[in-house]
């Protein structure tokens, strides 16, 4: 056919315009074209032509007569997409073809599951509420709002703002409670996120707050606590940052803390914890129990030759710790503790108030008077020195038979003995634990020979008790374990003295160093028990005032006492020992004076104090179970040098929960120590000990390692 | 008409490779993913993967990776799937399946039999 | 992935029984279940999409309901033209239920 002159070739009037449906929903594209003859419409996706009903009837898109697209419902899967896409609708006649300008058609989507639900929140009044939420991924990409308790929230109130997907209330109130939705919208329609609570709970706050109290002793205190909260507050006490110990405390029903009884160990902060879901408050009060002042060690009379030392022990407690100051009496002068020493003067007082005078004239001789002084009372205690020519000084008491370990039934009857010799006589008094016994017990009574008897025996009677003999001499302390149960013997067993090895004979003296005497001695009468073994015993004025165990276990009738000072005269005595217990004493040996030694230089040259450390070499005896809770460790020492300060005696548990702990140490700070008790051990455990010398920062080489095991129950006799 | 042809009956070694076609006619190829099932003499129907014509874009489930190929030649609206590394067990029927904007296989091939057989 | 467990794996009904298969999925998968009907030799064939929409061109005796994990295909009145296996398939991950084959009784 040939060219009309009215023909002209397609022009599109109408471009189709982008557009966003819904999935499943109906849409148009549209296209209108001018032309003549009458232009025909395809449409392209992507580039690729579109099938609709005039290729397959049964499609889901028609081209209308205008040279629309519609689409009778959008598809669109998870996958295939076939209807989304950018469109062009082209309009051909034979004169030419026209192209539309794209139109994108997105479909539409708003899955289900949110990507972020809301969840329960608590807050504490005052705080702000943070609700976040994630909405369904969708397209458009979904705005949100905020239902509580089904009603939409208007986020002009000043205190509420949403942003992102975030509602957050600034300064929440009881009234912001309830159940809170979140909305994810588009022109799909609208999902509800799962409903999450917002609860509003209060802080405790005290109403009332415990009050510093300053009480004394014996006296009753309460501790007032009184708060609210939503939820109720939980109030617990602690005592200086522990739990409250057990049995000493009541709490009532409105939480006060009330103590019938103060003691001195009640003193300390105690905090009211408040606690609920949303916070926790405490609040604190000291207790301080004012407690008179008491005698730990009373200073007692002593007879001391002239140029010799004498220390008048006094120690005191009390709350506050009671100020200890010492005068003669008939002398204006008082002496306090950490004076500086005044020229020319003797005296001096320790920290811990232990009158110490070097020296001794005869002028020293009188009544010394030990005063301790505090807010809650004053006491005071007088000791008289006699000062004699005589040279040899007396030796300490010496106690023939002390107390053996024992266990006896309830309702039983003990007998601890002591029987006790020295010049001037000695005077025998008992501790229980370290304190004073019998005190007003009428159940205990010390009989004429200083027999501790207790009868109608209780089950709190159990512990240690110390027979102590005391002169102007000295004192001599011997221990033993009394443990009652419900199934020991009901009475003593009294060791008749035929049970027990004769005493030996007196020792005499073989060989003497500057730090070391050798005794012999022959074993007791014929016709006696023999004995398995010795102790040597030995006695120094200026070491100490009593007799101490300077060697265990012997098995020879010869043996080297070592680790002695130098210059220092002694006095030994030997006992027997065999199953049953310990013989009375051999007599005393003359005294015997250890070599001297040329003063060393002044200054200490480290290379010799290291070097004579290191030729130490300490003997570690096996150790002896006290009590299910103290072990006796005794050494001897080879080769005692002149630059040692004492003993690290060293044991760490090797058993139960805390195996192979850290070691802990017990230092014996006088050279001359060759024994130490470790107290507090736990029950039915094995330790490993071993002993150390130490000069300053040198350290000798570790003794051997012991194994012992502590007992369950104590050991009976 | 809408509809998918495949290749015909293939016998195959062990340890060979076999390559299947899969003809669309009838609708936008481009426009629907095609995927991939099996199904061994008297057992189920194992699906076997995707591929999206669109971009060549595909996807296997664990037991097939390594082993199957999924392509297309848009030009002639034909997607292929090649399994290597044959195996007796892998004796089955293959079909193609186009998936619809509904989430479904609404259109299959007719079924492709694959022997391996030494 | 998701597996699918369909029960009964074959039944024997009469022509005019309402059959039921059920079908479960080891986690939620809302309502992306589709069902199939296969004949011997055949390929097989779409019946039921998104859980419960009829494809065009099926009869109205097939239905499908369920959601979340479980799900059900039921055929109100058996015609012979039923006699077939049926599989279920999760549209997420795509994977097929074992299959159900009904028989004549």
């Known amino acids: 056919s040939r060219l009309r002159q009215e023909d002209f070739p397609p022009r599109i009037v109408e471009h189709p315009s982008d557009v966003i449906v819904s999935k499943g929903e109906p849409t148009t594209l549209n296209c209108k074209a001018e032309g003549r003859p009458t232009p025909t419409i395809e449409w392209y996706k992507d580039g690729e032509r579109v099938e609709t009903d005039k290729d397959d009837p049964r499609s889901h898109r028609m081209l209308l007569p205008s040279g629309s697209l519609f689409f009778l419902r959008i598809v669109h899967g998870r996958r295939s997409k076939p209807d989304e896409g950018s469109y062009v609708c082209v309009a051909r006649n034979y004169l030419g073809e026209a192209v539309s300008r794209n139109a994108s058609l997105e479909v539409a989507l708003l899955r289900d599951d949110f990507r972020q639900n809301p969840t329960d929140v608590v807050v504490a009044a005052g705080e702000p509420a943070i609700l976040e939420c994630q909405p369904p991924r969708g397209h458009p990409e979904p705005t949100i709002y905020w239902k509580k308790d089904k009603v939409r929230i208007d986020d002009k109130e000043e205190r509420i703002s949403i942003r992102g997907g975030k509602l957050m209330i600034s300064n929440t109130r009881k009234s912001d409670a309830g159940m809170y939705t979140c909305v994810g919208t588009n022109m799909v329609g609208e999902r509800d996120s799962d409903p999450a609570e917002l609860t509003v709970f209060e802080r405790p706050t005290f109403l009332r707050r415990p009050i510093n109290q300053v009480v004394l002793e014996e006296e009753a205190v309460e501790f007032r606590c009184q708060v609210q909260g939503d939820p109720q507050p939980t109030v617990r006490w602690k005592k200086d940052d522990a739990d409250l110990p057990r049995g000493r405390y009541d709490i009532k029903d409105d939480y006060t803390l009330r103590i019938k009884k103060t003691m001195s160990t009640d003193e300390g902060t105690y905090m009211c914890i408040a606690e609920n879901r949303v916070g926790k408050m405490e609040a604190s009060a000291t207790l301080t129990v004012r407690a008179p002042p008491q005698f730990v060690v009373r200073p007692r009379d002593q007879i001391v030759a002239q140029g010799r030392t004498v220390t008048f022990p006094c120690e005191t407690k009390g709350n506050p710790q009671p100020a200890v100051f010492w005068q003669k009496e008939g002398s204006q002068n008082l002496l306090f503790p950490n004076q500086p020493q005044q020229p020319n003067s003797r005296c001096s007082v320790s920290p811990t108030g232990d009158l110490t005078i070097t020296n001794i004239q005869r002028s020293d001789a009188g009544y010394y008077i030990c005063q301790a002084l505090t807010v809650a009372g004053s006491i005071l205690a007088k000791a008289q020195l006699e000062v004699t020519d005589v040279l040899t000084d007396r030796p300490p008491p010496i106690i023939l038979q002390g107390p053996a370990n024992q266990t006896l039934a309830v309702d039983g009857t003990a007998l601890l003995k002591c029987k006790a010799t020295g010049d001037p006589l000695p005077v025998i008094s008992w501790l229980k634990e370290g304190f004073t016994f019998p005190g007003r017990d009428p159940r205990a009574t010390i009989q004429e020979q200083g027999t501790l008897q207790i009868k109608n025996l209780r089950i709190s009677d159990t512990g240690t008790y110390t027979c102590v003999a005391t002169s102007s001499s000295g004192e001599t302390s011997w221990s033993a374990v009394l443990d009652v149960t419900e199934s020991g013997a009901t009475i003593s067993k009294n060791y008749d003295l035929s049970d027990l090895p004769g005493p030996p004979s007196k020792p005499q003296v073989t060989d003497v160093t500057k730090n070391s005497v050798t005794l012999s001695w022959q074993p007791g009468t014929p016709g006696t028990l023999p004995a398995s073994a010795y102790i040597i015993e030995a006695f120094s004025q200026s070491v100490s005032n009593s007799w101490q165990t300077v060697a265990n276990h012997v098995k020879t009738t010869l043996y080297t006492v070592r680790g002695l000072r130098p210059n220092t005269i002694y006095l030994f005595m030997v006992r027997a020992i065999n199953p049953q217990g310990l013989s009375d004493p051999s007599p005393m040996s003359d005294p015997v004076r250890t070599q001297d030694i040329s003063p060393p230089a002044q200054g200490v040259d480290h290379r010799q104090v290291q070097k004579e450390l290191g030729d130490v070499l300490v003997r570690l005896h096996n150790p002896v179970v006290l009590t299910p809770t103290t072990v006796q460790v005794t050494w001897t020492v080879d080769r005692q040098p002149q630059f040692i300060q004492g003993y690290r005696v060293m044991y760490r548990q090797t058993s139960g929960l805390q195996a192979t702990s850290s070691w802990q140490n017990l230092d014996a700070k006088v050279p001359t120590e060759r024994s130490a008790v470790l107290v507090n051990l736990k029950k039915g455990v094995t330790y490993e000990i071993k002993v150390r010398p130490y000069f300053n920062e040198f350290q000798g080489m570790d003794s051997e390692s012991k194994t012992v095991r502590t007992t369950e129950e104590a050991p009976s006799a | 008409e809408v509809q998918l042809v495949q290749s015909g009956a293939e016998v195959k070694k062990p340890g060979a490779s076999v390559k299947v076609s899969c003809k669309a006619s009838?609708?936008?190829?481009?426009?629907?993913?095609m995927h991939w099932v099996r199904q061994a003499p008297g057992q189920g129907l194992e699906w076997m993967g995707w591929?999206?014509?669109?971009?060549?874009?595909?996807e296997f489930p664990q037991k097939f990776q390594g082993r199957v190929t999924m392509t297309r030649d848009t030009s002639i609206t034909t997607a292929y799937m090649e399994l290597s590394r044959l195996r007796s067990d892998d004796t089955a029927v293959y079909y193609c399946a186009r998936e619809s904007g509904d989430d479904a296989f609404d259109i299959w091939g007719q079924g492709t039999m694959v022997t391996v057989s030494s | 992935d998701i597996q699918m467990t369909q029960s009964p794996s074959s039944l024997s009904a009469s022509v005019g029984d309402r059959v039921t298969i059920t079908c479960r999925a080891s986690?939620?998968?809302?309502?992306?279940l589709n069902w199939y009907q296969q004949k011997p030799g055949k390929a097989p064939k779409l019946l039921i999409y998104a859980a419960s929409s009829l494809q065009s061109g099926v009869p109205s005796r097939f239905s499908g309901s369920g959601s979340g994990t479980d799900f059900t295909l039921t055929i109100s009145s058996l015609q012979p033209e039923d006699f077939a296996t049926y599989y279920c398939?999760?549209?997420?991950?795509?994977?097929f239920g074992g299959g159900t084959k009904v028989e004549i009784k």
């Open positions: 009838g609708y936008t190829f481009t426009g629907y993913y």
């Open positions: 591929i999206n014509p669109k971009n060549g874009d595909t």
């Open positions: 398939q999760q549209s997420v991950g795509l994977f």
């Open positions: 986690q939620s998968i809302s309502s992306y």
